[in-house]
Amino acid sequence: HTAAQDNCTCPTNKMTVCSPDGPGGRCQCRALGSGVAVDCSTLTSKCLLLKARMSAPKNARTLVRPNEHALVDNDGLYDPDCDPEGRFKARQCNQTSVCWCVNSVGVRRTDKGDLSLRCDELVRTHHILIDLRHRPTAGAFNHSDLDAELRRLFRERYRLHPKFVAAVHYEQPTIQIELRQNTSQKAAGDVDIGDAAYYFERDVKGESLFQGRGGLDLRVRGEPLQVERTLIYYLDEIPPKFSMKRLT
C-alpha cells in the first residue's frame, strides 16, 4: 500500500512505526500500541488510533436538536480492545474488571457492569452530528459557500464522499455538520463516518493525525474559519440502553 515509499512514513497516521519490510521490500506501517498493520492510503480506524494514543507518551433554530438517544463521549480516553480489522469490540473492560458496551465509534452505550455483562453485537453509529462554534468574524459566512467548503474538506482531507455529508446547518456562530452512513450504504473502500469525524475532531483541536501534512486551514472565500468549540453527538442504529438513574 501507499506508505510514502521514499522515506517510509504513513501519510494518514503519524502514530505508526514504519519499515521497508513489506512484500518486495515495500514500506509497511504498524500502529503504535497494537502493532496492527495499517493501510496508509486511507484513514486508520478510531479504535487503533485510540489504542496508539494511550500507548504514546502523555503530553501536558435551523439547527438540529439531537434527539434523546444521542450520545456524547463524556467518558474521555480509554485503552480500547480492537478486533483484527481494527474495529471496536462490542464489550470494553478496564483493568478493574468494570465492563460496558460501546457503539462502532467506541462511545459507551450502556451502564457499566462487571465481567458478566454481555454485549451481543457492535451497534453501528449511523448518524453523527458535529456541532461547532466559530470565532467571531466580520460577518456571517455565506451558507452555501460554507456547505461546499466543508463537503470538499471531508472529501479531500478525510476521503469521505460528499454523499455521506447529509447536511450542513449554519446559524452564526454555530455550524452543524451531519454525517449519515447506514450499513447498507457503506461500500468496500468507503471511509467510516466515525473515523472521519475523529480525524476532523483532532484536526480542529490542533492535534492532526496526518504525517507531514499541514494543519487544518479552513477558509470560506478566503476568510479563515477558526473553530473555538466542538461537540459531537452520536446516534446509533439501535438506541442505547441506560438505566433511568443515569437520566436523573
Epitope: 492510503s41 486511507t42 463537503r151 472529501r155 479531500e156 464522499h161 460528499p162 468507503d190
Partner: antibody, heavy 120, light 107 residues
C-alpha cells in the same frame, strides 16, 4: 487559461510499460484533485484513476488496479500515470482531467489527449 | 458498479429545434450526475454537474434535470456548434462510470 498537456503515449507491446505525463498550467494545481480518463477506439469513455490534491489518496477501477499508478508532483505542476502489464484492451486515447473544485468527481477541464496503442 | 444507460444512441435534429437526451442509472445516485459534450476530433467538455448545475461558460440553452435514477439533458434552440456526442457520468462514488454516449447529428 487552464491548460493540460499530455505526453508519453505511443505504441507498446502487450506486457510492456509506459509512463504518461500531464503538464498543468493556468490554475493552482496543488488545490485540485486530478484524474485520468481514456476513450476507447469505439468512443467509450472509461475512468482510469484519480488522485487528491496533495497526493495522499488514490482511486482506481478494478480493471487497472495493481497495474496502473497515478501520482503527482505539485512542485512541478505535473500529473503522471505509470502503466505496466499493458493489455490490448488498454489501447485508447488517454486524457488528463481536472476535477471540479466543488463538483467532486465531475471533470471540468480535459487535455487534448495522448494516444496509447498496445499491440504486438 | 453503477451502470449508466443513455438513450437514444443517436438522433438527428435541425438548428432551432429542442432535443432531450436521457440517462438512467442502475441504482440511486441522487443528484451526482454530470453531462459532457464532445465535438468531432476534440476533447470532452463539462456541461453540467450535480444533475442541474451548469458549468462555467455553458450557454443557458442547456439544462440538466432529474435525480435518483432518471436524468435528462435538454438543449433548447439547437445551434450549429451543438452537434457532436454527449455523455453522462455518475459521480456518486468509486468506480466512476460513463454512459455509452448519444450522437447528435444535423438532419
Amino acid at each position: 487559461e487552464v491548460k493540460l498537456d499530455e505526453s508519453g503515449g505511443g505504441l507498446v507491446k502487450p506486457g510492456g510499460s509506459l509512463k504518461l505525463s500531464c503538464a498543468a498550467s493556468g490554475f493552482t494545481f496543488s488545490s485540485y484533485t486530478m484524474s485520468w480518463v481514456r476513450q476507447t477506439p469505439e468512443k467509450r469513455l472509461e475512468w482510469v484513476a484519480t488522485i487528491n490534491s496533495d497526493g495522499i489518496y488514490t482511486y482506481y477501477p478494478d480493471s487497472v488496479k495493481g497495474r496502473f499508478t497515478i501520482s503527482r508532483d505539485n512542485a512541478k505542476n505535473t500529473l503522471y500515470l505509470q502503466m505496466s502489464s499493458l493489455k490490448s484492451e488498454d489501447t485508447a486515447m488517454y486524457y488528463c482531467t481536472r476535477v471540479h473544485y466543488y463538483g467532486y468527481d465531475a471533470m471540468d477541464y480535459w487535455g487534448q489527449g495522448t494516444s496509447v496503442t498496445v499491440s504486438s | 458498479e453503477i451502470q449508466m444507460t443513455q438513450s437514444p444512441a443517436s438522433l438527428s435534429a435541425s438548428v432551432g429545434e429542442t432535443v432531450t437526451i436521457t440517462c438512467r442509472a442502475s441504482e440511486n445516485i441522487y443528484s451526482y450526475l454530470a453531462w459532457y459534450q464532445q465535438k468531432q476530433g476534440k476533447s470532452p467538455q463539462l456541461l453540467v454537474y450535480s444533475a442541474k448545475t451548469l458549468a462555467e461558460g455553458v450557454p443557458s440553452r442547456f439544462s440538466g434535470s432529474g435525480s435518483g435514477t432518471h436524468f435528462s439533458l435538454k438543449i433548447n434552440s439547437l445551434q450549429p456548434e451543438d452537434f457532436g456526442s454527449y455523455y453522462c457520468q455518475h459521480h456518486y462514488g468509486i468506480p466512476l462510470t460513463f454512459g455509452a454516449g448519444t450522437k447528435l447529428e444535423l438532419k
